[in-house]
């Protein structure tokens, strides 16, 4: 299962903390929300320059 993107302690926080599983970081309100609220599908790679499918070990957004 995909871990959610990292949340921020504050707007200028240098070290983001991870959202809990099934949550994603909402860039516009700057906190973690349910991933399903964000229209956040897995990306479809289009070529060599596109990222590989995500794994739990990859850094999140």
């Amino acid at each position: 299962m995909r871990r959610g993107p990292r949340s921020l302690r504050g707007r200028d926080a240098p070290a983001p903390t991870p959202c809990v599983p099934a949550e994603c970081f909402d860039l516009l309100v700057r906190h973690c929300v349910a991933c399903g609220l964000l229209r956040a599908p897995r990306p479809k790679p289009a070529g060599a320059s596109s990222p590989a499918p995500r794994t739990a070990l990859q850094p999140q957004e």
């Epitope: 516009l28 309100v29 964000l38 229209r39 990306p43």
Partner: antibody, heavy 118, light 113 residues
């Protein structure tokens, strides 16, 4: 596939209100951010604002208090109202959906040209 | 707001040539989460804008590999290795790091020389 379609009058008189509808199919507007963007003659793109999954809104300060974005979740539509228009508001108006993983506009309506003229 | 400065405004090219478009932001586009949310769109005549490149260098689904994006911080470039007729239109860079509002470059019109 997600599809967006703008509708509304193509001609609005100065000082009147511009009203547009964006009809969304293939996705629910109770998920994600739904946006209005306009393109002026000469290619300048201006971000106007959004309505979010929760119904909260953001309006570009450049539009001051002239703008309102609302939604009807039962119809899966969201709306733009721009008050007191002038000829400077003549533009092609687009509604667009926002990808919430990489934060780009992944789906756009075809756009509707609105001319402000008496 | 972040100002996105695109150059050139017009780019006449011959088919098969390489084209290069520059985009500069008024502040660094590196988000505090480490990501750089700089994207490129192409608007063909009579169409709405379509995503080409996301997060500086990632081609969107279906985008030919002749398109490539590069850059960091405040300076970014879109390159088309061999221009084809279907590439003509207006290219926009856009940032989603310091939002809202989302902001766009002024556009570069790619046209036949």
């Amino acid at each position: 596939d997600v599809q967006l379609q703008e509708s509304g009058p193509s001609l609005v008189k100065p000082s009147q209100t511009l009203s547009l509808t964006c009809s969304v199919t293939g996705d629910s507007i109770t998920s994600g951010y739904w946006n209005w963007i306009r393109k002026f003659p000469g290619n300048k793109l201006e971000y106007m604002g959004y309505i979010s999954y929760s119904g909260s809104t953001y309006y570009n300060p450049s539009l001051k208090s002239r703008i309102s974005i609302t939604r009807d979740t039962s119809k899966n539509q969201f709306y733009l109202q721009l008050l007191s228009v002038t000829t400077e508001d003549t533009a092609t108006y687009y509604c667009a959906g926002l990808d919430g993983l990489y934060w780009y506009f992944d789906v756009w309506g075809a756009g509707t040209l609105v001319t402000v003229s008496s | 707001d972040i100002v996105m400065t695109q150059t050139p405004l017009s780019l006449p090219v011959s088919l098969g040539d390489q084209a290069s478009i520059s985009c500069r932001s008024s502040q660094s586009l590196v988000h505090s989460n480490g990501n750089t949310y700089l994207h490129w769109y192409l608007q063909k005549p009579g169409q709405s804008p379509k995503l080409l490149i996301y997060k500086v260098s990632n081609r969107f689904s279906g985008v030919p590999d002749r398109f490539s994006g590069s850059g960091s911080g405040t300076d970014f470039t879109l390159k088309i290795s061999r221009v084809e007729a279907e590439d003509l239109g207006v290219y926009f860079c856009s940032q989603s790091t310091h939002v809202p509002p989302f902001t766009f470059g002024s556009g570069t019109k790619l046209e036949i020389k």
